[in-house]
Structure formats: structure tokens, C-alpha cells
Amino acid sequence: QVQVVTQDEREQLYTPASLKCSLQNAQEALIVTWQKKKAVSPENMVTFSENHGVVIQPAYKDKINITQLGLQNSTITFWNITLEDEGCYMCLFNTFGFGKISGTACLTVYVQPIVSLHYKFSEDHLNITCSATARPAPMVFWKVPRSGIENSTVTLSHPNGTTSVTSILHIKDPKNQVGKEVICQVLHLGTVTDFKQTVNKG
């Protein structure tokens, strides 16, 4: 049967993003409509047809355009994605003979981790804090020279859609740690990044 091929995309916040749909059919469509999926009913964003060209709905005027003007292959581009743009989008190919054939492409917005790593001595112990803020939520791990060191983790969700994960390493005998390297590992979207800290006695 006739189908539409799509691909989900993950793009960084405040960068451009494109979603593409391809109608797997011998014939082009008569009109292509892009809609944003919403809880109640989909919202029309933009249409393209030979008769009327590109027609962008007012709410999307400065946000998107159709960058591949095709009736078999259609691409919309968001100029500068925000968190509100995250979601799923439907492309509807209104074809002669087979009606509306739709595909769904989902856009996920990510924010690269911002990481801070610092330490603080107390009289009898050392706290090393590693904090990572990202979207989706990052994970924080420790690589330390010896085992048995305790850590505590706090997760905080922010209104802007990012999540902070703060992990504190509690070292009871700080003298043994002086001059040694501690590594905070941040896992985000399948990539692990090492942040190294050498403890110096202030």
C-alpha cells in the first residue's frame, strides 16, 4: 500500500531543525499539509500546492517555512527551535485516487550539558560536587582511585525544561585524596564526557 516515509529528528535548542516526509507513490500529491499534533485536534501549520504555493498559518509565519517545495517530498524547517516546538508533526499528502496519506515525524529538542565541578574541604572531610544541567536529564557518575566512597545525588527540574543533576562525593579522609585525580562522568544522549579534578590542599 502507499505509504509515507519519515524520520524523527533531535536538534539543539535555538538552532534550525528540519523534518522531511516522502510519499512512496508513483504520483505526486495534489496538496501537502503539515500539522502539529495536539491533544484535542491537530493544528494546521502550512500547506503547499501548485494552485496556491506555500500558505503559512499566522501562528507559524516567522517560525517555519517549507524548504523542499515538493508534492512527493516535502521538508519543513524551523528557523530557531524552542522547547514549544518539541512534539510530533503530521505531513498529509492529499493524493488523487487515494485520498489523504499521512506520515508522522517527531522533533526532540536537546540542550547540551553545562557542567560545574568543584571541591570544598571541611575539617575532617572533603566534598566534591559535580553538577550537570541538560535536556534530557543527564546522568552523573564518579571515577575515583579507591572504592567505598559515598555519594549523594539530587535531581532538580527547571521551568525552562532542563534538568540539573548534582552529585556530591563525600570523602572522609581528605589527606589521602590530595594530589589525586577525581573524574566526574556525565552521560547525555549516549555520550560520556569526563571532567577531571585534582584535589590540592589549599
Epitope: 502507499v2 508513483a26 495534489l30 494552485n51 488523487f96 485516487g97 487515494f98
Partner: antibody, heavy 117, light 107 residues
Framework: QVQLVQSGAEVKKPGASVKVSCKAS????????ILWVRQAPGQRLEWMGH????????NYNLKFKGRVTITRDTSASTAYMELSSLRSEDTAVYYC??????????WGQGTLVTVSS | DIQMTQSPSSLSASVGDRVTITCKAS??????LSWFQQKPGKAPKSLIY???RLVDGVPSRFSGSGSGTDFTLTISSLQPEDFATYYC?????????FGQGTKLEIK
Amino acid sequence: QVQLVQSGAEVKKPGASVKVSCKASGYSFTDYIILWVRQAPGQRLEWMGHIDPYYGSSNYNLKFKGRVTITRDTSASTAYMELSSLRSEDTAVYYCGRSKRDYFDYWGQGTLVTVSS
Amino acid sequence: DIQMTQSPSSLSASVGDRVTITCKASQDINSYLSWFQQKPGKAPKSLIYRANRLVDGVPSRFSGSGSGTDFTLTISSLQPEDFATYYCLQYDEFPYTFGQGTKLEIK
């Protein structure tokens, strides 16, 4: 040159089936939809259904309640329209045509199907 | 199903006349309408598609207009070969449906 050549006239008894062929030549068969319309004596044209030869996807007028089947043989560049459980009101001229999207340009010469006891 | 109603059902005119045939859809069909000409014992011939686009090879005296529910086919100056029956076809919604036809006869 482009041609759609249909099979010859048929006389059928009520309850029987008829299969009309439409042989295409002069173009790439899978690039155009093949459609079938019919016209009973003194009546308007009636869309029966169509097929996209590329995938073999077809769409039928539900008025025919599953009595119509449209198929194709890409190796023979031929489309077929089969109508079953024939009744007298199916007496008509059956035409095949081709379209690129909504652009209809060539038609077969028509096949007269007579249903009579 | 969408009903297509043509008017008039028949029409007498002379060579050189300007003739208008109308087609009304029972609901909005956008611009998804074609016009066909048919002569006795012959297959239909496509004249106009998408309401106002002329099919290649069709004389420019034929024109189409309209959108939504009301459409017209105009022949600006009738020629002897134009006497035939004309049908409109909607293809906005399946099943696609034809009008009942307008028979154009010589006066």
C-alpha cells in the same frame, strides 16, 4: 504513441462475471493511474474505481459492494476490471483511462457488456 | 456521496455563440473538478482539470472557473465540433462522482 486498447464486447447471463482488459502501450505503464468508468444507456458516467500500477493499490466505488475488482499485470502492461454477480443494470459501456494525478489524457475505445438472460 | 448537479440538462445554441454550463456540488470540493466532453459512442475527452486548467491540445475557447461548490465551463465561440454532451467530475472525495450531463445541440 500512447494507446489503451480494451478487450471486445461481451454478452453475459445474470449472476455471471465479466473481466475486461485494458492494454497500455507507448508509455511507462507504472507511471499513470488506470481508472475505470462505465456508462449505461442514456445514463451519466459512473466512476467504478482505479489502480496505481506502481504498487497495485486500488480503490473502489462502494456502490458496487465488493463486486468490482481491479488488478494489473505490469509485465503485460495490462489492467483488468472484473465485475461479478452481474445483473441487467450492469449493461453498459466500460471505459478505461489513464491519469497522472488529476490529469486525464488517454482513454480506451470502450467495451460493451450486455447482461441478458 | 457528493452530488453533482449540472444545469442546464440540455442547451440549443448556434455556431459562434458563447455558452456557459454550470455544475454545483452538494458540498465544498475545493478546486477538485474536471470537465469532459463526450460524443455518441465515444470515450469521454478531458477538457479542464482542477477547475480552471486547460488540458494540452484543448482549444483556448474552452475555459473553466469556480471553486468550493459552484463551477462553470465556458465555450467562448461555439464551433461545429463542440456539439456534444459535457460532464463535470468531482474528485475531492471518494467515490468520485459525475454530473448528469449537459447535452449541447445545434439550434
